[in-house]
Interface confidence: low
């Protein structure tokens, strides 16, 4: 069966939107009005992985682009990147682990934990227009909570 996907945008707990900042970078900033059209639309695919009631494995691709968020080691540190893939082969049900995030729902907020690097989360900075990154702390200065908006 084909992999089930939905289109959505994400905002962090400070209501910052995610936009492209270079071919392989995302940044988070506050957008209003027409500028909201700049925000990235994700194609969230429901993939194979450990699943529970509040933890669902997903892959986060960019809608209409063959780019996926992935987690790799760079200089011995878990790092978030946008990785290009062959559009003929993605998305697929059994995604490589670096593409998989555990979508965790807590109090109507979402966290995205790397399946490759447990306890590392998609994160944003408090500061405006800074890169989206993989962070190893929850509940600290950096933001790991998101809300999801469905896009038709």
């Amino acid at each position: 069966a084909p992999v089930r996907s939905l289109h959505c945008t994400l905002r962090d707990a400070q209501l910052k939107s995610l936009v492209m900042s270079g071919p392989y970078e995302l940044k988070a900033l506050h957008l209003q009005g027409q500028d909201l059209e700049q925000q990235v639309v994700f194609s969230m695919s429901f993939v194979q992985g450990e699943e529970s009631n509040d933890k669902i494995p997903v892959a986060l691709g960019l809608k209409a682009k063959n780019l996926y968020l992935s987690c790799v080691l760079k200089d011995d540190k878990p790092t978030l990147q946008l990785e290009s893939v062959d559009p003929k082969n993605y998305p697929k049900k059994k995604m490589e682990k670096r593409f998989v995030f555990n979508k965790i729902e807590i109090n109507n907020k979402l966290e995205f934990e790397s399946a490759q690097f447990p306890n590392w989360y998609i994160s944003t900075s408090q500061a405006e227009s800074m890169p989206v990154f993989l962070g190893g702390t929850r509940g600290g200065q950096d933001i790991t909570d998101f809300t999801m908006q469905f896009v038709s």
Epitope: P23, Q38, L67, S84
Partner: antibody, heavy 118, light 107 residues
Framework: EVQLVQSGAEVKKPGESLKISCKGS????????IGWVRQMPGKGLEWMGI????????RYSPSFQGQVTISADKSISTAYLQWSSLKASDTAMYYC???????????WGQGTMVTVSS | EIVLTQSPATLSLSPGERATLSCRAS??????LAWYQQKPGQAPRLLIY???NRATGIPARFSGSGSGTDFTLTISSLEPEDFAVYYC?????????FGQGTKLEIK
Amino acid sequence: EVQLVQSGAEVKKPGESLKISCKGSGYSFTSYWIGWVRQMPGKGLEWMGIIYPSDSDTRYSPSFQGQVTISADKSISTAYLQWSSLKASDTAMYYCARYTNWDAFDIWGQGTMVTVSS
Amino acid sequence: EIVLTQSPATLSLSPGERATLSCRASQSVSSYLAWYQQKPGQAPRLLIYDASNRATGIPARFSGSGSGTDFTLTISSLEPEDFAVYYCQQRSNWMFPFGQGTKLEIK
């Protein structure tokens, strides 16, 4: 049809300024990076810089940083390459090209020949 | 800064023969490598992206392989229109350099 159409050939004198253009059509111009590539007579391809028209985020090759300026006007789907003071060594063919998400320049303009001579 | 070195500089072959062009990176570029063909008086044309994927409309006689630092463009059986200059190109962070080119000429 997806295409990039560049402005015509230019003949200039050393010290003059110049701005050449690259107009995109047939696709969402703001969704793709546009790169500029130089080819000096009888030589190979040299990447100069790249711009994302949506927000004009621009990155330059160190070899061209400070030598040229890359800009874009998304309202008319056009990217630009400009010089404030041309040198004879700027004589070359200049191509614009669309940069895809799979790490390649897939659509190329026809090229603009710039000749700088006194 | 990553440097791409293509070899040979010139390759002389006859139609129907197999052509093998090499591109070596000074450090690993994963699979972020593309190949282009350029004929005299024309703009370059994308042949291969991500090391091994043929671009739209490119004949099956063109194939790419390799990863890391060593990449190969193979033309299985040369047609008269294949004689041209071939360039490899890669991305590393915000650098997009090209190799110096291989001229494929008729023997």
